[in-house]
């Protein structure tokens, strides 16, 4: 029978007796910074490269043996995950080891560093194909070995990395905290995030999805024949790499923005039972279990968007957060969140010629998080649009002007401290879904997107009484771009996008009371390229 | 791991160079910065990665790397150039006493500066 | 489904000696400790002994110690146990289990998490009389 | 060795009462303890690991709960199918002790 974790990671469709999708990453080089491995272990013979790097701090303890098989136990799995025979994820793809960690597990920044340098030395004397690095280690949070993998990353290497095994934000943890790795979390059979002893996996905003990472049967530096139950964000971590060495043997011209959004869009969602997080991690961390895609081509057509959190503000009045966008996304939508209800709002500006999403705190707030929807959205020419604070009472609106634009998104920033509490609601007069509307002492951001084939319609969904929590999504082949909160509704805490559905929270309604402004209207954009959908099709 | 940059692995006790001069001053308004690891256990004070401005050459970081040896000597501090990055990140790897730091953080080119820290299997 | 046959049990006389195996189906058998225990008719479980995946650990119950031996075929994907000397007091139904438990890495150090006996079979029952 | 005891011995309930055994180690051993259903003629069923962790597929009226030295499995509403014997497992070390078991029977 197939060992759960890969049954979980494969979609229907493959499941047959035996794992065996098509083509499994034969055309992918995974490079692995970790434990010196056993070679020749059947699982893996013939499909590790042991390359000669080594760069290890010596063991801790007078008392320490070094037993080859203890030396070698967590490479040697980890290889067998990827790319073992038997019990791997990509049964095709190469992989080379490089030593950065001791018979104790234990590494230094430095000599990762090193061996990240090694492998860029690697790339640039003998190009190969689609190059994937697994680093299933963590240490605490370094300036250094984020900005290397961020070299790397930029240089098209795909760096998957572990979140780390803490039961911690992630976000203090590298390589787990570069935004340009894919940081991976760890659930077991039973969607659940892992538990090891007192600790387990990390979650948060730098966390990009969760993967299988409890009771994973792979290969045992034992005996050649030997396999062993290991678990960790490490094993999770393996499948991903694995997954992605499948993605990139498929369409080997993939970048690394495209790659995390298909990972990101083929994941099954919202399957993880969330209470296990802190209370206030749980709407920073993704609800995402990797999988293969259903079929290894024509994924092309659609539009993919994701959500990025920013750090959090800090409390102090003028304290802002920014969310950014990878290089090769467009930032589509910023909204913004305060646990307080605290906040001024959100708006995209430039910064270094590219746009962000900032979001202001307000005086005597918590803290904000700017919320970005960054997507793959090729020959976009994208701006923002921007109306002042109106003086009618009929409330500030702007709208795309530019022939050929549409809205994808709508921000609204205030100066006051607390605005709308005694205002009623402005409405949207019915017709006019290309603009975006806020209250007259607010500047109204629109974000206009002009691209071959892209169309996009507004979707509201409202409840007179007051909610928690008011949702809209889009429907099947539309994507997310834009989620916001109708102006009126004074309790309102933020918006942000989860997945397909715009989210519009509110304070406890107990706290609020039943009035007439306890309305709360949740405004989604939904997008659509039907160029990119021709596109797929005319590939076909 | 043989070090490929064998010429700085030696320890030097060197008696004032030409490179020790106040050419290269750093940059007015420009401050590198120090970093290290928050969880104090993972920290390995004595070692410290030098990362140097995005577009320094290779021979700049070698010499920025003998120049904080030279005037290490002179204030009679041993220290060990361990690596020298480039491919990457420009920089080095330096054993070296933290009371040095205050001046290899005054040295040209420098962008910040990192204290060793251990990482472990997850 | 993993499963788990034993077989080698039946009537033996005080001071004789048995062989139990056990038949595991799925390379997950040898991905776990295994362990023998037992049932004394009308008595409660007594764990007898166990073994690590590669057979280079393996711990004993004391009134066993001595007397029984466990050992693993990974080929065959087997577990055995060789009872000598046996009295009536060892007279139970024998069962393999599977001890299912996890490796995992903390910070530098290599920690076993252990979820119990999750897959048994179906008992072989062994008699020691004259 | 590790001694572990339970108690009751035997337990006579009804359909839809709730239950508890509780099970005493002789010394600390942190949550490592496991629980187990076994009816006549049949072998053990695992139910409950690390104290408080449900094994997959197994209903959630069962539960764990302690550490250290002393120990409870809760059946919150009895079902037909719940009369059995229940044991409990220490696992602090390789090597393992059970408790003697507890006989829940239909009053």
């Known amino acids: 029978s197939i060992p759960w974790n890969l049954e979980r990671i494969t979609p229907p469709r493959y499941r047959a007796d035996e794992y065996q999708p098509p083509d499994g990453g034969s055309l992918v080089e995974v490079y692995l910074l970790d434990t010196s491995i056993q070679s020749d272990h059947r699982e893996i013979e013939g499909r590790v490269m042991v390359t000669d790097f080594e760069n290890v701090p010596e063991e801790d303890g007078t008392r320490f043996h070094r037993q080859a098989s203890k030396c070698d136990s967590h490479g040697t799995h980890l290889a067998g995950v990827v790319s073992g025979r038997d019990a791997g994820v990509a049964k095709g793809a190469s992989m080379r080891s490089l030593r950065v960690l001791n018979c104790q597990g234990k590494g230094t920044v430095s000599g990762t560093l090193i061996g990240l340098e090694f492998i860029r030395k690697s790339q640039l004397v003998q190009p190969v194909g689609p190059l994937v690095v697994l680093l299933p280690l963590a240490g605490g949070y370094s300036r250094v070995l984020n900005a290397a993998c961020q070299r790397l990353a930029r240089a098209g290497v795909v760096l998957v990395t572990a979140a780390g095994n803490f039961r911690d934000d992630a976000c203090l943890y590298s390589p787990a905290s570069a935004p340009e790795v894919i940081t991976v979390g760890a659930t077991n059979a039973q969607d659940q995030p892992v538990t090891l002893g007192t600790l387990g996996t990390n979650f948060g905003r730098c966390v990009d999805l969760f993967a299988p990472g409890e009771d994973i049967i792979g290969a045992s530096s034992d005996c050649s024949t030997c396999f062993v139950s290991q678990s960790g964000t490490s094993q999770a971590a393996a499948h991903v790499a694995g997954i992605a060495a499948m993605m990139l043997s498929a369409e080997p011209e993939l970048t690394l923005a495209e790659l995390r959004q298909r990972l990101i869009h083929f994941s099954a969602k919202d399957v993880i039972n969330e209470a296990w997080f802190p209370e206030d991690q749980r709407v920073l961390t993704p609800n995402l279990v990797a999988a293969l895609p259903p079929s290894t081509h024509g994924a092309g057509w659609q539009l993919f968007c994701r959500t990025v959190w920013s750090a959090h503000s800090g409390p102090t009045r003028m304290a802002t957060a920014v969310a950014r966008c990878a290089p090769d996304e467009e930032l589509l939508s910023c909204s913004s969140f305060s646990r307080s209800g605290k906040r001024r709002g959100e708006r995209m500006e430039a910064q270094g010629g590219k746009l962000v999403c900032r979001a202001h705190n307000a005086f005597g707030g918590e803290g904000v998080y700017a919320i970005a929807r960054c997507c793959l959205l090729p020959q976009a020419n994208c701006s923002v649009h921007t109306a002042p604070p109106a003086e009618a009472s009929m409330g500030t609106r702007v709208h795309c002007h530019q022939q050929g634009h549409v809205l994808t998104g709508c921000s609204s920033h205030w100066e006051v401290e607390d605005l709308g509490t005694h205002k009623p609601p402005v409405l949207r007069p019915r017709g006019q879904p290309n603009q975006c509307v806020g209250h007259r002492e607010a500047s109204i951001h629109a974000s206009c997107c002009h691209a071959p084939g892209l169309e996009c319609k507004v979707k509201e969904h409202g409840i007179p009484a007051p909610q928690e929590q008011v949702t809209v999504a889009c429907e099947e082949g539309w994507t997310l771009t834009g989620c916001s909160a109708l102006p009126g509704t004074s309790h309102v805490l933020g918006a942000y996008a989860v997945d397909n559905t715009c989210v519009v929270r509110s304070r406890d309604v107990s706290t609020t009371g039943s009035t007439s402004e306890g309305a709360v209207t949740a405004v989604a954009i939904c997008c659509r390229s039907r160029h990119l959908a021709q596109a797929s099709q005319e590939l076909q | 791991q043989e070090d490929e940059d064998g010429d700085y692995e030696e320890l030097v006790l060197a008696l004032r160079s030409e490179e020790d001069g106040l050419a290269e001053a750093p940059e007015h308004g420009t401050t590198a910065t120090f970093h290290r690891c928050a969880k104090d256990p993972w920290r390995l004070p004595g070692t410290y990665v030098v990362v140097l401005k995005e577009e320094t050459h290779l021979s700049q970081s070698e010499r920025t790397a003998r120049r904080l040896q030279a005037q290490a000597a002179r204030r009679g501090y041993l220290t060990k150039i361990l690596h020298v990055f480039h491919g990457l990140l420009p920089g080095f790897l330096v054993k070296m006493s933290g009371d040095l730091l205050e001046l290899a953080l005054k040295l040209p080119h420098v962008d910040y500066i990192e204290e060793d820290s251990s990482v472990f299997a997850q | 489904e993993v499963q788990l046959v034993e077989s080698g049990g039946g009537l033996v006389q005080p001071g004789g000696s048995l062989r139990l195996s056990c038949a595991a189906s799925?390379?997950?058998?040898?991905?776990?400790?295994m362990s023998w225990v037992r049932q004394a008719p009308g008595k409660g479980l007594e764990w007898v002994a166990n073994?690590?995946?590669?057979?280079?650990?393996?711990y004993y119950v004391d009134s066993v110690k001595g007397r029984f031996t466990i050992s693993r075929d990974i080929a065959k994907n087997s577990l055995y146990l060789q009872m000598n000397s046996l009295r009536a007091e060892d007279t139970a139904v024998y069962y393999c289990?599977?001890?299912?438990?996890?490796?995992?890495?903390?910070?530098?150090?290599?920690?076993?998490?252990?979820?119990?006996?999750?897959?048994w079979g179906q008992g072989t029952t062994v008699t020691v009389s004259s | 060795d590790i001694q572990m005891t339970q108690s009751p011995s035997t337990l006579s309930a009804s359909v839809g009462d709730r239950v508890t055994i509780t099970c005493r180690a002789s010394?600390?051993?942190?949550?490592?303890l496991a629980w187990y259903q076994q009816k006549p003629g049949k072998a053990p069923k695992l139910l409950i690991y690390?104290?408080?962790s449900l094994e997959s597929g197994v209903p959630s009226r069962f539960s764990g709960s302690g550490s250290g030295t002393e120990f409870t499995l809760t059946i919150s509403s009895l079902q037909p199918d719940d009369f059995a014997t229940y044991y409990c497992?220490?696992?602090?070390?390789?090597?393992?002790?059970f408790g003697q078991g507890t006989k829940l029977e239909i009053k």
């Open positions: 010394q600390s051993i942190s949550s490592w």
């Open positions: 799925g390379i997950t058998f040898s991905s776990y400790w």
């Open positions: 497992q220490q696992y602090n070390s390789y090597s393992y002790t």
């Open positions: 073994i690590k995946q590669d057979g280079s650990e393996k």
């Open positions: 289990a599977r001890d299912r438990g996890t490796y995992y890495y903390g910070s530098g150090s290599y920690n076993y998490y252990y979820y119990g006996m999750d897959v």
């Open positions: 690390k104290a408080s």
